[in-house]
Structures are given as C-alpha cells and as structure tokens.
C-alpha cells in the first residue's frame, strides 16, 4: 500500500467574520494507525485547534462521518469565526504512541477573515472656533479585515481634500484600524453644515459607512451689535434698541451700562432663528431723559458663549429736553412706577 | 446494525487443528484492523492476534507459528486457523473490531468456545 | 511486553456507592487504555477508550482518567446492574495486554 499523503486541496479560505469556515483534509490511506490534529501555524508555538483523540473543541465539528473508518475526510468545521481565527492551518496525521508521533502534515490551508470595519466615528475640536479659522475633524474605524480600505471627507456633499489618513498597524496583523484627519475652513454660513467621514470596505458590498459631525457643535459665530435710538414715544422718554444679530450658539447674556454704570442685564431666551441657523435678538431700553442733566452715554454690552464682551455705545443727548425741576438722577429715583429707565427684549 | 458472529468452535484433540471464522455486517471489515481475544474458562482476558487494513499481521508470542489471522474480503469475513492445538488453547475466543482510528475495542462478537482435549 | 495491573483484584460495594478502580501500566502508554465490563456468560462491553471517552450509548456515571502509567475506572452510583467484572487494556502497542480484572461485587 502507497505511504499515506495528507492533502489540503485549499491554499487558502476566505470568510466574512461571525461564518463558518470549512477547513478541507483528506488522507490517502488508513495507515499507520493514530489520531488526526489540525493545528494553526508550524512550529513549536503551533496552536491546536482539533484533535481526534482527545481534548473539547466547541467550535470545531467533523463535516464528514468521523465514526466510520473507511472515513478519509477529516475536514473540519470552525464555527463564528472571528479576526483572531486568522492563520495557516495545517492537518497532521500522527502514529499512534507513546507519546504519538507525528507521521506527515498537510501543505496547510491559509485562513483569511473579512471584518466589517466599525462604525467611523468622527469627532471635531474640543472648543468652538470662529469663522476663517481651520478646525481639525478624525474619523477612526476599528476591527477591519483585510487592510485595504479607502476613507474620504465630505462637507455638505463636497468632498475635502485636506485631510491625512493613516492605517494601523503596518505589518501583518488580524484586524487593522484606521485613522484619519481633516482640515476644515467655517464659515459663517456653517451652522446647518456636516462633515462626513465615509469609509468602504470590500466586506460592506457598496454600501459605504458614514459617521457625520455637525458643525453646529464646532462653530461661534459672533454677533454684530447695532445700537440705535428710536422716536420718542412720550414726553420725555427715549426708546434706544440694541439689535444682536447673527450670533450662535444661542448662549449671551446682554449688559445695559448708562455712563459705565450696570444698568440692567438680562440673559437671551424669545431669539429669532435665521435661515442659516444663527440668531438675532434685540433688547430695548425706555430712557427717561428728564432725569439726567447731561448727556449719557449708553452701552450695550454682550457676552457670547463666554468669550470676552463686545459693546456698542449710543450718546443720548439731554439738552435738547427741558429739565423737570427738582428732579434728580435716575439713581436717586426709587419710585417703582417712576422709573426713569425701563427694559424689554425681544 | 453492526454485528460480528463467530463460528467454527468445538472440540479438537491436541496437535489438531481449528479454523474459526467471523462474519462481520453493517460494516466493512477491510476498513478496520480486526482481532481475536480469546478467555479460558474463570480466567482474564487475553489478547491473541491482530490484521491491519493492509494485511499485516500480528500474534501474542504463545501462538507464533501455530495461528494465521486472514480476512476475506469478498466475504466480508475474519478467519482464526489455529494448528497444533494445545490444552492451554482452550477457551472462548472473541471477534473484535478495532477502532476509528487508534484501534480501541468498539464491537465485539458473541464468542465461539474451543476445547483442546484428549 | 506491558504488563498492565489492576487493583482491587476483588471489591465489595452497596448500591448507590461510588467505587474506583485503578489500572497501572510498566511503562508510558500515553493514554491509550480501554475499560470493559463483563457479565458471567457473556462478552465484554467496551466502556472506555483513550483512558477517558466514552463509548456510545455507555452512562456518564462511567469516568475514566490518567495518562502514562495510572489510570482509574470511576462509577459514580452503583446500580444493580453494574455488578460485574471490569478489565483495563493497553493498546498502544503489539501485543496488547489486559490487566487480571476487578470482580465487583454486591456487599
């Protein structure tokens, strides 16, 4: 009878994580008696994976009829199979002994594992910038299997060119990860805008993943202030308006300061929202000008998500109003329905 | 079903001879390494002789010589010629199948008694 | 040749106990040991193969262990008919040997 020859008809399998792989061995002959292992990678570190003998091997199944001798088919089966299963695996035939012998290996069977890669996830700076200023996006994805992937940017449906990818790690590995960084110029039109990291794979059949940033969580755009003084509603008394325009987020808090002194401060709740996303607020100050005797100067002060203050000032002029007599500074007049300068916002 | 039925005992003088057979069904027989266990009468176990799947040959040291293990194929069958018949060949001799693939007993026959007598 | 030994030669138990057989080798046999069980009158059953698998359709309360030299037969519970006589065998190598046997028997 001719030696017996161990035939591994597959120089290399495929499989998408989370199958099965069929593992393929046939041998040539009954003899010489003993046990059939199958063994990931050669050499004295080889990991086994089956043994016929002896031994619980849970995600390992004969395909073919193990309990019949004339049974030459020792393939096997390895159930939810996952990026670590990657590797040459070899079918090995041993003589019975004491310890068994090896007596001959198969050619091996490279075992390679598709790995969807993760969803990307994208993640902008830490603090909000400004209009003109170039911010920096990532876009990481893990676990992919094999390495080759393509990773491209996006914002608002235009594909970025500024951007710098890298995938870890170089050499062989089970699973491979990937990083990228892109450079993004706000506008302030950038409220509503996204920046997308697609990636494709070729375990993902066409449909490409996305992980999205909204912009809105990156950008500030500051307000414009326009301070204006409107007619005269009553005698003596001058309605000035501190127009907020264009500002996001919608956090500000206004200070009204009359001659550098705090006059009232109230915080941005009933905005309008534009198109673009940014807000426009106003709030009103009812000034009382028969309470001063000289000119004042008025200030609208605001503080925007926390950033330094920005103000206007608006000069009232009083001499062109005849004074009451024995009136005084609207400081000294504490009437509650007297007041010389009222408040609103709108 | 698997099975394995002997025949051919019974009684021989000593210096006779005896030929004992197997016929083994649901199974092929060639496949597997086949044996003959024989137990003299209140005694252990003894293994006696042994055929591979590739016709080779195997005997315990008492019967070198003496016995010849062969296998019809066609017949699906186990023969056990055993010449110059002792006393001390008395006993029931069993048919047993080897194992899958490390010949462990896994099927044995009902057994078929010998008696070497004068 | 291997001469393989068991002990007890004889053991009397009570159903319900859980009895233990063991079977040394005079040399390595890695784990190439088998059980059987014989009944007055008729041929062995095969319990046990590779010191510690168990043949199809045989009971769990039936355990084998040990590699190289020692190995033991374990019945978990006795029952009535597991009253017999218990043989272990090398067969790692020509010619295979079986220990003298364990006669179990009812206390």
């Known amino acids: 009878e001719e030696e017996l020859q161990v035939i591994q008809p597959d120089k290399s399998v495929s499989v998408a994580a989370g199958e099965s792989a069929i593992l393929h061995c046939t041998v040539t002959s009954l003899i010489p008696v003993g046990p059939i292992q199958w063994f990931r990678g050669a050499g004295p570190a080889r990991e086994l994976i089956y043994n016929q003998k002896e031994g619980h091997f849970p995600r390992v199944t004969t395909v073919s009829e193990s309990t019949k001798r004339e049974n030459m088919d020792f393939s096997i089966s390895i159930s939810n199979i996952t990026p670590a299963d990657a590797g040459t695996y070899y079918c090995v035939k041993f003589r019975k002994g004491s310890p068994d012998t090896e007596f001959k290996s198969g050619a091996g069977t490279e075992l390679s594992v598709r790995a969807k890669p993760s969803a990307p996830v994208v993640s902008g700076p830490a603090a909000r910038a400004t209009p003109q200023h170039t911010v920096s996006f990532t876009c990481e994805s893990h676990g992919f299997s094999p390495r080759d992937i393509t990773l491209k940017w996006f914002k608002n449906g235009n594909e970025l060119s500024d951007f710098q990818t890298n995938v870890d790690p170089v050499g062989e590995s089970v699973s491979y990860s990937i990083h990228s960084t892109a450079k993004v110029v706000l506008t302030r039109e950038d409220v509503h805008s996204q920046v997308i990291c697609e990636v494709a794979h070729v375990t993902l059949q066409g449909d490409p993943l996305r992980g999205t940033a909204n912009l809105s969580e990156t950008i500030r755009v500051p307000p414009t202030l326009e301070v204006t003084q409107q007619p005269v509603r009553a005698e003596n008394q001058v309605n000035v308006t501190c127009q907020v325009r264009k500002f996001y987020p919608q956090r500000l808090q206004l200070t009204w300061l009359e001659n550098g002194n705090v006059s009232r401060t109230e915080t941005a709740s009933t905005v309008t929202e534009n198109k673009d996303g940014t807000y426009n607020w106003m709030s009103w100050l009812l000034v009382n000008v028969s309470a001063h005797r000289d000119d004042v100067k008025l200030t609208c002060q605001v503080e925007h998500d926390g950033q330094p203050a920005v103000s206007k000032s608006h000069d009232l002029k009083v001499s062109a109003h005849p004074k009451e007599q024995g009136s005084n500074t609207a400081a000294e007049n504490t009437g509650s329905n007297e007041r010389n300068i009222y408040g609103g916002s709108g | 079903e698997v099975q394995l039925v002997e025949s051919g005992g019974g009684l021989v003088q000593p210096g006779g001879s005896l030929r004992l057979s197997c016929a083994a069904s649901?199974?092929?027989?060639?496949?597997?390494?086949m044996h003959w266990v024989r137990q003299a009468t209140g005694k252990g176990l003894e293994w006696v002789s042994a055929?591979?799947?590739?016709?080779?040959?195997y005997y315990t040291g008492s019967v070198k010589g003496r016995f010849t293990i062969s296998r019809e194929n066609a017949k699906n069958s186990l023969y056990l010629q055993m010449n110059s018949l002792r006393a001390s060949d008395t006993a029931v001799y069993y048919c047993?199948?080897?194992?899958?693939?490390?010949?462990?007993?896994?099927?044995w026959g009902q057994g078929t008694m010998v008696t070497v007598s004068s | 040749d291997i001469q393989m030994t068991q002990s007890p030669s004889s053991l009397s138990a009570s159903v319900g106990d859980r009895v233990t057989i063991t079977c040394r080798a005079s040399?390595?046999?890695?784990?190439?040991l088998a059980w059987f069980q014989q009944k007055p009158g008729k041929a062995p059953k095969s319990l046990i193969y590779t010191a510690s698998s168990l043949h199809s359709g045989v009971p769990s309360k039936f355990s084998g262990s040990g590699s190289g030299t020692d190995f033991t037969l374990t019945i978990s519970s006795l029952q009535p008919e597991d009253f017999a006589t218990y043989y272990c065998q090398q067969y790692v190598s020509y010619p295979y040997t079986f220990g003298q046997g364990t006669k179990l028997e009812i206390k």
């Open positions: 055929i591979g799947t590739a016709g080779d040959t």
């Open positions: 047993v199948r080897g194992g899958v693939w490390d010949d462990a007993f896994d099927i």
């Open positions: 040399q390595d046999i890695n784990n190439y």
């Open positions: 649901g199974f092929t027989l060639s496949s597997y390494d």
